[in-house]
């Protein structure tokens, strides 16, 4: 997960945009990525970075959980 997020974040050269990506990775079981992104007011660049990283992180976590279930963990 960390490697993949670092790979995505590396393309954002504006520090705030990069941090928006990292914010998207934080675990929040109560809201979807879309719901969380809707509260961002600093600009579309932040929304885009946040959403991309949030979705990728959610997918990777879901895949890992699925693998764990398959392995009977």
């Amino acid at each position: 997960l960390q490697e993949k997020i670092e790979e995505i974040a590396a393309k954002y050269k504006h520090l705030v945009v990069k941090k928006c990506c990292y914010d998207g990775v934080r675990i929040n079981h109560d809201e979807t990525c879309e719901q969380r992104a809707a509260r961002i007011s600093v600009g579309p660049r932040c929304v885009k970075a946040f959403t991309e990283c949030c979705v990728v992180a959610s997918q990777l976590r879901a895949n890992n959980s699925h693998k764990d279930l398959q392995l009977g963990r």
Partner: antibody
């Protein structure tokens, strides 16, 4: 309407520090990044750094080698730029500006003249 | 850091004529289809004023005689026709990455 109002002109001795303020009004202060630029007499614009007041995130131009510190007071909607170890080459007009959509500077302060002289 | 090189450094134009200023970036200021190049006008004793953002979008209240174009590393600001009040310094600026950088400026004088 959106306004950025800066503090008044300063005259400083070499080696001292200066702190310039930039009071924002007419919009939600925490929604936009505040940048600081400077312009030496007859010269172009030089970017110094910025702060995102909502999170306190900052980034600085490495040319200033740790001499610049940008802070923000959310309670008064004011951003500050402090420059230390002043030298004569720091004589310039210092501007704050709001960055809209993480793309462009749509509103600027009126500028603060800082003169460094012994 | 992205270096922005403006040319010419100064320009004298007759009223009614066209003024063209170019800005060349040391690397692309495009990102995922968007251009992060902006243009500002600065008159003596005043702060810079936004003219054009994202390469070609006119800020509100800016006369239509100002236009911007370009992509990647090469950008142009055009004033057509030039008017007397356009006497000023013009700066390009990129915001695709930190540190934000400005071009060296172009001084436009009206003959």
């Amino acid at each position: 309407q959106v306004q950025l109002v800066q503090s008044g002109a300063e005259v400083k001795k070499p080696g001292s520090s200066v702190k310039v303020s930039c009071k924002a009004s007419g919009y939600t202060f925490t929604d936009h990044i505040i940048h600081w630029m400077r312009q030496a007499p007859g010269q172009g614009l030089e970017w110094m750094g910025y702060i995102y007041p909502r999170e306190g995130w900052t980034n600085y131009n490495e040319n200033f080698k740790g001499r610049v510190t940008i802070t923000a007071d959310k309670s008064t909607s004011t951003a500050y730029m402090e420059l230390s170890s002043l030298r004569s080459e720091d004589t310039a007009v210092y501007y704050c500006a709001r960055e809209r959509n993480l793309e462009y500077f749509d509103y600027w302060g009126q500028g603060t003249t800082v003169t460094v002289s012994s | 850091d992205i270096v922005l090189t403006q040319s010419p450094a100064s320009l004298a134009v007759s009223p009614g004529q066209r003024a063209t200023i170019t800005c060349k970036a040391s690397q692309s200021v495009d990102f995922e289809g968007d251009n992060y190049m902006n243009w500002y006008q600065q008159k003596p004793g005043q702060p810079p004023k936004l003219l054009i953002y994202a390469t070609s979008n006119l800020d509100s209240g800016v006369p239509a005689r100002f236009s911007g174009s370009g992509s990647g590393t090469d950008f142009t600001l055009t004033i057509n026709p030039v008017e007397a009040e356009d006497t000023a310094n013009y700066y390009c600026q990129q915001s695709v990455e930190d540190p934000h950088t400005f071009g060296g400026g172009t001084k436009v004088e009206i003959k």
